[in-house]
Interface confidence: medium
């Protein structure tokens, strides 16, 4: 499969476990992948009794679940880890939970940050 309409070159990066994993905590990530495969951005988080705990954000490799998604929307009902992916630069800045089985849509806005570029 070729690149999608909204080609992804950069994503918002975040790692809650940055100290242990010895990475940056947040910034921008340049996406790299194989020539014939699509690239995406993702966001992952937990929801503990209504408190949102961001886990990771970054680049995600070719995944049909992300094709032609301009917004980052998690659709599973009550997962252990919420996950969404999308196509387009920085499309993972905002992320939403909208269960396929119905229920309230919840959108998470990022706090303002001064991102650093990860290469």
């Amino acid at each position: 499969s070729g690149r999608g309409e909204a080609e992804t070159r950069e994503c918002i990066y975040y790692n809650a476990n940055w100290e242990l994993e010895r990475t940056n905590q947040s910034g921008l990530e340049r996406c790299e992948g194989e020539q014939d495969k699509r690239l995406h951005c993702y966001a992952s988080w937990r929801n503990s009794s209504g408190t949102i705990e961001l886990v990771k954000k970054g680049c995600w490799l070719d995944d049909f679940n992300c094709y032609d998604r301009q917004e980052c929307v998690a659709t599973e009902e009550n997962p252990q880890v919420y996950f969404c992916c999308c196509e387009g630069n920085f499309c993972n800045e905002r992320f939403t939970h909208l269960p396929e089985a119905g229920g309230p849509e919840v959108t998470y806005e990022p706090p303002p940050t001064a991102p650093t570029l990860l290469t």
Epitope: N17, E21, S44, V55, K56, G58, W60, L61, D62, D63, F64, N65, Y67, T75, E76, E77, P79, Q80, V81, F83, E100, A101
Partner: antibody, heavy 117, light 107 residues
Framework: EVQLLESGGGLVQPGGSLRLSCAAS????????MTWVRQAPGKGLEWVSV????????YYADSVKGRFTISRDNSKNTLYLQMNSLRAEDTAVYYC???????????WGQGTTVTVS | DIQMTQSPSSVSASVGDRVTITCRAS??????LAWYQQKPGKAPKLLIY???SLQSGVPSRFSGSGSGTDFTLTISSLQPEDFATYYC?????????FGGGTKVEIK
């Protein structure tokens, strides 16, 4: 209780075909990607194929591409694996598994044995 | 494709021992790694997801760590029911490849 039950395995000659089924219960089948994994006798696990919840997206391991077809019928809560042009090296226990990609496969069937000889 | 290399391929240990299994990816996979336990004649069972998160119902003596290319599964105090084969799997990029497995045997 969440359950997966495979069927359709058996003995087949090289070049032959088989269709495996996996009946799912206890969860909203159409909301989850489903996967086939196989294990040759005395060997490790090999990922075979995955299909999206809607059935619109599929991926295959290079070893089965062009010979195997994964499909699903969400109205019947059933996953399928159509296996054509079977080879001796396809001999294995075939497992179906549920799970969002990011957390791995959290529910597995008991497996069905395919012997190509 | 991303190759997953597990070591050791087998380990002999006694009840109460601390056992460590390592898994190395041929390229960075962030923390998108799962660990499974398989007993003879049975289907695999998910132990750890996202490199370090314990699957519901799995005893706390199992723990996972690592990020990028190097990962570890630790059994803090081996129990009789833990003698089995353990597999890692990367879930970052299709095909979702497994490691070759580590058999934990009774010493």
């Amino acid at each position: 209780e969440v359950q997966l039950l495979e069927s359709g395995g058996g003995l087949v000659q090289p070049g032959g075909s088989l269709r495996l089924s996996c009946a799912a219960s206890g969860f909203t089948f159409g909301s989850y990607g489903m996967t086939w994994v196989r294990q040759a006798p005395g060997k490790g696990l090999e990922w075979v194929s995955v299909i999206s919840g809607s059935g619109g997206g599929t991926y295959y391991a290079d070893s089965v591409k062009g010979r195997f077809t994964i499909s699903r019928d969400n109205s019947k809560n059933t996953l399928y694996l159509q296996m054509n042009s079977l080879r001796a090296e396809d001999t294995a226990v075939y497992y179906c598994a549920k799970g969002p990609r990011i957390v791995g496969m959290d529910v597995w069937g008991q497996g069905t044995t395919v012997t190509v000889s | 494709d991303i190759q997953m290399t597990q070591s050791p391929s087998s380990v002999s240990a006694s009840v109460g021992d601390r056992v460590t299994i390592t898994c190395r990816a041929s390229q960075g996979i962030s923390s998108w790694l799962a660990w499974y336990q398989q007993k003879p004649g049975k289907a695999p069972k998910l132990l750890i997801y996202a490199a370090s998160s314990l699957q519901s119902g799995v005893p706390s003596r199992f723990s996972g760590s690592g990020s990028g290319t190097d990962f570890t599964l630790t059994i803090s105090s081996l129990q009789p029911e833990d003698f089995a084969t353990y597999y890692c799997q990367q879930v970052f990029s299709y095909p979702l490849t497994f490691g070759g497995g580590t058999k934990v045997e009774i010493k």
